[in-house]
């Protein structure tokens, strides 16, 4: 018995179905086929879970969280024992193993391993201004999404005037910040933060209004 090489890693957007491949060759009939799918969750590597089981011509549910979401892609028994997972969740991310036995065919590689990563687009980021908006001050524009896998990167842009950040601006795409030093009237305007990762983007807006000093009456 020989389980074929798997693609190694599969990525899927949260909520979408995933197919985890596992095929094998055997010299024996499929009368005594036994297939166990296990997962080692990324969130709990010390606690492997059973996903689905085929034994004695019957299918059995694995861990409760997979109930109603998991099944074999084809009619069993077969040499293609790939499974699907519907409505993928973040907690489905992990390393999946198919263990195949088909007596009396013993020996060879009877395990296939496939990694599953469930991706999450950035949630709507939160935009805020840190610091005084008085002319001549330094301000920081902050942007962060609570959700996003892979971790989002952040790009600040200006949506009015010359369509670019002031030359005194320094951008950090990882932290989601823009520091604008020595703000002037030209720094005023509409700023947009774009949070993006491999599967999506999300935006938020900030209206920066630089405050000019009020003339004081000397009496």
């Amino acid at each position: 018995l020989e389980v074929s090489e798997s693609p190694g890693s599969i990525q899927v957007a949260r909520g979408q179905p995933a197919v985890l491949p596992c095929t094998f060759t055997t010299s024996a009939a499929l009368i005594n086929l036994n297939v166990i799918w296990m997962v080692t969750p990324l969130s709990n590597a010390n606690q492997p879970e059973q996903v689905i089981l085929y034994q004695g011509g019957q299918m059995f549910d694995g861990a409760p969280r997979f109930h109603g979401r998991v099944g074999f892609t084809g009619t069993m028994p077969a040499t293609n024992v790939s499974i699907f997972i519907n409505n993928t969740q973040l907690s489905d991310t992990g390393t999946y193993q198919c263990l195949v036995n088909n007596l009396p065919d013993i020996g060879g590689r009877n395990i296939g391993v496939t990694g599953l990563t469930v991706l999450v687009p950035p949630s709507a980021p939160h935009c805020q201004i840190q610091g005084s908006q008085d002319i001549g001050s330094d301000v920081i524009l902050l942007c962060s999404s609570e959700e996003g896998i892979p971790r989002p990167t952040y790009l600040w842009e200006k949506l009015d005037n010359t369509l670019k950040l002031p030359p005194t601006a320094t951008q950090d795409q990882v932290q989601g910040t823009v520091t604008i030093r020595n703000i002037s009237a030209l720094s005023s305007g509409l700023y947009q933060c774009v949070a993006s990762n491999a599967i999506g983007t999300s935006t938020c807006l900030l209206d920066l209004q630089v405050i000019s000093p009020q003339p004081r009456n000397i009496g």
Epitope: E157, K158, L159, D160, T162, K164, P167, L186, Q192, V194
Partner: antibody, heavy 121, light 110 residues
Framework: EVQLLESGGGLVQPGGSLRLSCAAS????????LSWVRQAPGKGLEWVSA????????YYADSVKGRFTISRDNSKNTLYLQMNSLRAEDTAVYYC??????????????WGQGTMVTVSS | ASVLTQPPSVSAAPGQKVTISCSGS????????VSWYQQLPGTAPKLLIY???KRPSGIPDRFSGSKSGTSATLGITGLQAEDEADYYC???????????FGGGTKLTVL
């Protein structure tokens, strides 16, 4: 090497469409606002359209508004100009240009070599 | 016609000084920065001056810029044969959300 390279120009009939591309290399593409500028044969420079670093903001010259669309793909470091309902007066060399991050005002510090668009029947 | 007015042509002898004007209004030059470009025959334009009077690295100090009210001026001293080119000013109008070039000035070195 820091450069911009336009492509997609050619001969097109009046009323037709064309999409120009501008491939950038050697700098952090998404940090820069970009523009398309054109020059009709024997004439001066004419600004056509501009787009912000993330693509969220864009401006157009009155002469192309409603017919041309500027866009960018930051994952491919590429700027585009979709030109529809082309007219004979759109015949020109089209340049893409980068707006300097060192300037408060508009200042195109990097230009492509240009691509020729000819609108003729 | 461009909303920024430049003289169609200027000329001067080598070693001399020349100025090129760019005239606009309060909606463009009057409230915004100006940049200047040199275009040699058959080539793409090149940035000479930005933010009214700043020179990018590599631009010789023979080139200078200034702005007063609704007009901007490019100055070139110690004229050289290789300065023969077309020169353009550029600014933007906040209200119209457009960038605008001047009509261009052809500089001839006699």
């Amino acid at each position: 090497e820091v450069q911009l390279l336009e492509s997609g120009g050619g001969l097109v009939q009046p009323g037709g469409s064309l999409r120009l591309s501008c491939a950038a290399s050697g700098f952090t593409f998404s940090f820069y606002s970009l523009s398309w500028v054109r020059q009709a044969p024997g004439k001066g420079l004419e600004w056509v359209s501009a787009i912000s670093g993330g693509g969220g903001g864009s401006y157009y010259a009155d002469s192309v508004k409603g017919r041309f669309t500027i866009s960018r793909d930051n994952s491919k470091n590429t700027l585009y100009l979709q030109m529809n309902s082309l007219r004979a007066e759109d015949t020109a060399v089209y340049y893409c240009a980068r707006d300097s991050r060192d300037a408060y005002g508009v200042a195109f510090d990097l230009w492509g070599q240009g691509t020729m668009v000819t609108v003729s029947s | 016609a461009s909303v920024l007015t430049q003289p169609p042509s200027v000329s001067a002898a080598p070693g001399q000084k020349v100025t090129i004007s760019c005239s606009g209004s309060s909606s463009n030059i009057g409230n915004n920065y100006v940049s200047w470009y040199q275009q040699l025959p058959g080539t793409a334009p090149k940035l000479l001056i930005y933010d009214n009077n700043k020179r990018p690295s590599g631009i010789p100090d023979r080139f200078s810029g200034s702005k007063s009210g609704t007009s901007a001026t490019l100055g070139i001293t110690g004229l050289q044969a290789e300065d023969e080119a077309d020169y353009y000013c550029l600014t933007w109008t906040g209200a119209g959300r457009i960038f605008v070039f001047g009509g261009g000035t052809k500089l001839t070195v006699l």
